[in-house]
């Protein structure tokens, strides 16, 4: 007996965009983060809202290949980045282009994944070697989250579980998500 | 909090058959592969099998194929391991366990974040 | 299958003392598929290491983990009462999934 036959569908999106209530962690890559801090400015400006609804960050639209040892995806994945400013709604997508991107009084929110989808994606192996199938679960939306004076960065990564969550201060920081994700047909096949 | 309730203890009789489940809370079993695994007294773990809660698919040990049947419900959010042709080889813990990733600096990680409680099994006449 | 083969399968250690724990595998894995798990008795395992090397959270900084091809090996640089437990590794390289027959770690 030998595993299953692998659907060769390549990649299919999952319909079901679920909800999360604890949401995988997002890796806080300087890279990507831009995040704009204080710059001396005082702690009050004009735009300050103390309603979370009101603020909304940058979605950076980010495509990578799911890999697996030599096995990659056929096609590229396509997700979010949620960058690390968050401002006033109403300012956000237009003034960014004038340059006058509103700049956060400290470090009062983080933006940060909202929502996930799930895709199912297939792993091609080099050799003859099986495919291999994984459902990768990949940043859909993102939101402004508040911090208190209790929450540092790394608080901000929920997990879908404490145990399984990283541990803060520790190397390698994955962006880890609490998928069903990359899921692995692994190696062989039998 | 996200949890995997497993179904409680039995004791069955050898040649029987047995369904145990698991439920999961917080999350969708969509969007996750759920995983067996059995540990006998005194002894290791040993996977069983896999199953992708989404369309049905799974895989199995070849040493399971033919005593274990996963399937899942996911109008209740649940996956379940039956087993069959019980012997005293089937006393055992059985867990459930969530199959999530991580992806960072290129890598993708697979790992299993989520464990159930576990149900004892006991066969004997 | 890959079969993975743990030494010791039962070691005392005294409080404040290093441990190391191995981790042989048949043959030669990516560090990303390696990981260990900590259970003590009655319960269920718990993720501790994913990756050869990155702890999960709550695991005490004085774990570490290492290890690349087919050794791999799992470190307390100073024993703890609350280490003692049976560690599992488990590879994630190929089906089917295998697991280490578990060392057993025992205060002295």
């Known amino acids: 007996q030998g595993w299953q036959a692998f659907k060769n569908d390549a990649t299919e999106i999952i319909p079901e965009l679920g909800e999360y209530p604890e949401p995988p962690p997002e890796l806080e890559n300087n890279k990507t983060m831009n995040r704009a801090e204080n710059g001396g400015r005082p702690p009050h400006h004009p735009f300050e809202t103390k309603d979370v609804s009101e603020y909304s960050c940058r979605e950076l639209h980010f495509t990578r290949y799911v890999t697996d040892g030599p096995c990659r995806s056929a096609k590229p994945v396509t997700e979010l980045v949620c960058s690390g400013q968050c401002g006033p709604a109403r300012l956000l997508p237009n003034a960014i282009g004038r340059g006058k991107w509103w700049r956060p009084s400290g470090p009062d929110f983080r933006c940060i994944p909202d929502r996930y989808r799930a895709q199912r994606v297939q792993l091609l192996c080099p050799g003859g070697e099986a495919p291999r199938a994984r459902k990768v679960r990949l940043v859909a939306s993102c939101k402004c989250k508040r911090l208190t004076r209790f929450h540092n960065q790394s608080e901000l990564k929920d997990f879908g579980t404490e145990a399984a969550r990283p541990q803060k201060g520790r190397k390698p920081r994955p962006r880890a998500r609490s998928a069903k994700a990359n899921q692995a047909e692994l190696e062989n096949a039998y | 909090e996200v949890q995997l309730q497993q179904s409680g203890a039995e004791l069955v009789r050898p040649g029987a058959l047995v369904k145990l489940s698991c439920t999961a809370s917080?999350?969708?079993?969509?969007?996750?592969?759920l995983h067996w695994m059995r540990q006998r007294p005194e002894q290791g773990l040993d996977w069983i099998g896999r199953?992708?809660?989404?369309?049905?698919?799974?895989l199995y040990d070849p040493k399971f194929q033919d005593k274990a049947t996963l399937t899942t419900d996911t109008s209740s959010n649940t996956a379940y391991l039956q087993l069959s042709g019980l012997t005293s080889e089937t006393t055992a813990v059985y867990y459930c366990?969530?199959?999530?990733?991580?992806?960072?600096?290129?890598?993708?990680?697979?790992?299993?974040?989520?464990w159930g409680a576990g149900t004892t099994i006991t066969v004997s006449s | 299958e890959i079969v993975l083969t743990q030494s010791p399968a039962l070691m005392a250690a005294s409080p404040g003392e290093k441990v190391t724990i191995t981790c042989s595998v048949s043959s030669t894995i990516s560090s990303n598929h390696l990981h260990w798990f900590q259970q003590k008795s009655d319960t269920s395992p718990k993720p501790w290491i994913y990756g050869t090397s990155n702890l999960a959270s709550g695991v005490p900084v004085r774990f570490s983990g290492s290890g690349s091809g087919t050794s791999y090996s799992l470190t307390i640089s100073s024993m703890e009462a609350e280490d003692a437990a049976t560690y599992y590794c488990?590879?994630?390289?190929?089906?089917?999934?295998?697991f280490g027959a578990g060392t057993k770690l025992e205060l002295r």
């Open positions: 488990q590879q994630w390289s190929s089906y089917p999934l295998t």
């Open positions: 917080d999350f969708n079993i969509k969007d996750f592969y």
């Open positions: 366990s969530r199959e999530a990733d991580y992806f960072h600096d290129g890598t993708s990680y697979w790992y299993f974040d989520v």
């Open positions: 199953i992708d809660p989404e369309n049905g698919d799974t």
